[in-house]
């Protein structure tokens, strides 16, 4: 990375991440400097790479909704780290401006 700039996720992973190994997620938004919208899922094991996923996919929406209604045991890491789980080719987004962190909200049971 040049001068602390972080890569944007430029390609969705073909792999699906099991719900129970995900700690949290954050959104990558094109309006904030990245070329595609994406959801970056953070595994519970911090040694594992984030996974870049298509926000329009059913399984992604299910997992996001599940995380949104689950009280967060710990906050996800700050910033927008590289997604080593998906290939990245092309233009970089500068810094972490392309990522928006979404923490799990403390909501009551049920919708």
């Amino acid at each position: 990375s040049d001068g602390g700039a972080q890569d944007c996720c430029l390609k969705y992973s073909q792999r699906k991440i099991p719900a129970k190994v995900v700690r949290s997620y954050r959104k990558q938004e094109p309006s904030l400097g990245c070329s595609i919208p994406a959801i970056l899922f953070l595994p519970r094991k911090r040694s594992q790479a984030e996974l870049c996923a298509d926000p329009k996919e059913l399984w992604v929406q299910q997992l996001m909704q599940h995380l949104d209604k689950t009280p967060s045991p710990q906050k996800p890491a700050q910033g927008c780290r590289k997604d080593r789980g998906a290939s990245k080719t092309g233009k970089k987004g500068k810094g972490s401006k392309g990522c928006k962190r979404t923490e799990r909200s403390q909501t009551p049971k049920g919708p």
Partner: antibody, heavy 117, light 107 residues
Amino acid sequence: QVQLVESGGGLVQPGGSLRLSCAASGFTFNSYSMSWVRQAPGKGLEWVSAISMEGYSKSYADSVKGRFTISRDNSKNTLYLQMNSLRAEDTAVYYCARGYGYYFDVWGQGTLVTVSS
Amino acid sequence: DIELTQPPSVSGSPGQSITISCSGDSIGSQYASWYQQKPGQAPVVVIYDDNERPSGIPERFSGSNSGNTATLTISGTQAEDEADYYCGSWDSNPTHVFGGGTKLTVL
């Protein structure tokens, strides 16, 4: 209050077609995935199909793949199930259900589809 | 796709605790839910995310999920609990599967 109301069921001959509708009210329809679940007379529940919030991503049970098509119209708060090449074994009460993460939190009362000659 | 197997029936006297099992290959790696269905009615979720109880569901309903078995426990069964119970789970496809259902009879 949150409500799902199915319609469109009825008697149809084998090989025929039918389109079911599910009218949603009382919640922001485009913020939830939706599913169809069926129950043959005296039998258990069988998941049929699901669709993502904006309709981009769809999933089907093997038993209906290639014959049934799920869709939604978020401007009308309505979920659909187009059923083609119907068989006797498709006879069931069809429920629409709202997905909330990994479970179904709201169900309609169902509409009966009978496939018989 | 995962197959979920439930006992066809279980019974218990009022006040007794009953358990209904739901067996499937590595179901513990997915989230399980449980639905109660009374005759002529639509199903109602009683447990979701393995062990969470929706508001309005009595505390006597609880769940667990580990390995190859998810379990619904009703502690102190009451007459109004008599119904069919179905377990359910999503796999990563994502497709959903229900168990065959268990008829609970309160003696």
